[in-house]
Amino acid sequence: MRTEAQVPALQPPEPGLEGAMGHRTLVLPWVLLTLCVTAGTPEVWVQVRMEATELSSFTIRCGFLGSGSISLVTVSWGGPNGAGGTTLAVLHPERGIRQWAPARQARWETQSSISLILEGSGASSPCANTTFCCKFASFPEGSWEACGSLPPSSDPGLSAPPTPAPILRADLAGILGVSGVLLFGCVYLLHLLRRHKHRPAPRLQPSRTSPQAPRARAWAPSQASQAALHVPYATINTSCRPATLDTAHPHGGPSWWASLPTHAAHRPQGPAAWASTPIPARGSFVSVENGLYAQAGERPPHTGPGLTLFPDPRGPRAMEGPLGVR
């Protein structure tokens, strides 16, 4: 368990001495403070590469840049897991790996990164505009998901570098650069706060947040009693949209498929919303959301151009798979 400080909504200063200049000097410290508070936020990176040798064979690499212990990794395609995506593989750090066609080989590359090779033949083969998502369930950070796809015009084998090193280098460079700025910013912030210490500042409200934060659940026991836990394979149609998982069991999905997040606004996007989401024309991109932030009603820490956010406040129960069938 850990306590995270949540940055309160900025309240406009009372009218008076400061005027327009005061507005600027007060907004800056809070922007810097926000950056300081969210500086240690973990991220997930995703790299998708088409093999030059087999045109319809893909390699997906994902990694988690955070300090928590990874409980589980789920790789899906066609959208975020639990929001229309179809599970390709589930990896547990000690208990092993489950994978479903067209996944050919899923494996751990390091303690915090995985790779997945997709078979490239027949109706189940992926195509260039397919989106692949990786979800890392980590404690105490929560669930973090990132998605990536090949740009439409990419040449086979050249869509992304053969290793995730450039991505990691970019991240490290970013981390180092941002760290410098943040260090300077935090020092400057302390300086400003010291100068304005006579003025009462809004307090930070600490709140206990962890993957065990309460969740609203809509149970459906009658369905669950017959639901299949494991789906040995998934039939994927050629249009590259995620296919329905066929389990040959008459009673719909399991109880947790119906599980709902606390706030409707935080529900993961459905397939329709997903289909209309523009994908940046890059072979790899980072996109993160922590269920903990969504739960607390706080804005996700990393947003900006090229970042698509998929809130999932439900933790690993939302992971589709053996029981996660519709």
């Epitope: 409980s71 993957p211 494991h230």
Partner: antibody, heavy 122, light 107 residues
């Protein structure tokens, strides 16, 4: 090494409640779940329910749904199982066992606690 | 719920003999089946998971096979410490269920 240590034997009257604890050590508690299994004297094994140590989601057997509550305390790596409105047929050895952080995958039980005998008698 | 039927209920064999235990599911559980061994006064111990994978520290004389509805646990050559009760468990459907057990006793 990986170990689950359970609380001691309990004797309860019908209608009372019992809370059994299971302290885990030797592994990352939040990377797994805990399942509870009971065994009546001379009988086979009966699955009671499961809790994820990662996000505290639970799954209970239909027979005990409404009477059983499972919780975890990640700060002490301890799982708890509370059974209410006890009946004589609840007399059994209750085992905790390490399972998976999600119910759907990897949910075999290894290792097991030593067991806690709960006797319900008037 | 899935019903697991174990047979025979009791198996009387001598040390060194081969033991074959059967577990049949009322409907397909794919390969998601585990086997446990339990000795009197002890907690069960995992032997096999996912039908055929030996758990850590389990001797090679224990092997599992099968998929769908029919599963087998084989002990190639019984050792004195192998005389115990063996349970199968399906991990494929909710609720998770156990078989009634097979007791392997000394002949």
């Amino acid at each position: 090494q990986v170990q689950l240590v359970q609380s001691g034997a309990e004797v309860k009257k019908p209608g009372a409640s019992v809370k059994v604890s299971c302290k885990a050590s030797g592994y990352t508690f939040t990377s797994y779940g805990i399942s509870w299994v009971r065994q009546a004297p001379g009988q086979g094994l009966e699955w009671v329910g499961w809790i994820s140590s990662y996000d505290a989601s639970t799954k209970y057997s239909q027979e005990l749904q409404g009477r059983v509550t499972m919780t975890t305390d990640t700060s002490t790596s301890t799982a708890y199982m509370e059974l209410r409105s006890l009946r004589s047929e609840d007399t059994a050895v209750y085992y905790c066992a390490r399972g998976s952080p999600i119910y759907e995958h990897f949910n075999w039980f290894d290792p097991w606690g030593q067991g806690t005998l709960v006797t319900v008698s008037s | 719920e899935i019903v697991l039927t174990q047979s025979p209920a009791t198996l009387s064999l001598s040390p060194g003999e081969r033991a074959t235990l059967s577990c049949r599911a009322s409907q397909s559980v794919s390969s998601y089946l585990a086997w446990y061994q339990q000795k009197p006064g002890q907690a069960p111990r995992l032997l096999i998971y996912d039908s055929s994978n030996r758990a850590t520290g389990i001797p090679a004389r224990f092997s599992g096979s099968g998929s769908g509805t029919d599963f087998t646990l084989t002990i190639s050559s019984l050792e004195p410490e192998d005389f115990a009760v063996y349970y199968c468990q399906q991990l494929s459907h909710h609720p998770l269920t156990f078989g009634g057990g097979t007791k392997v006793e000394i002949k």
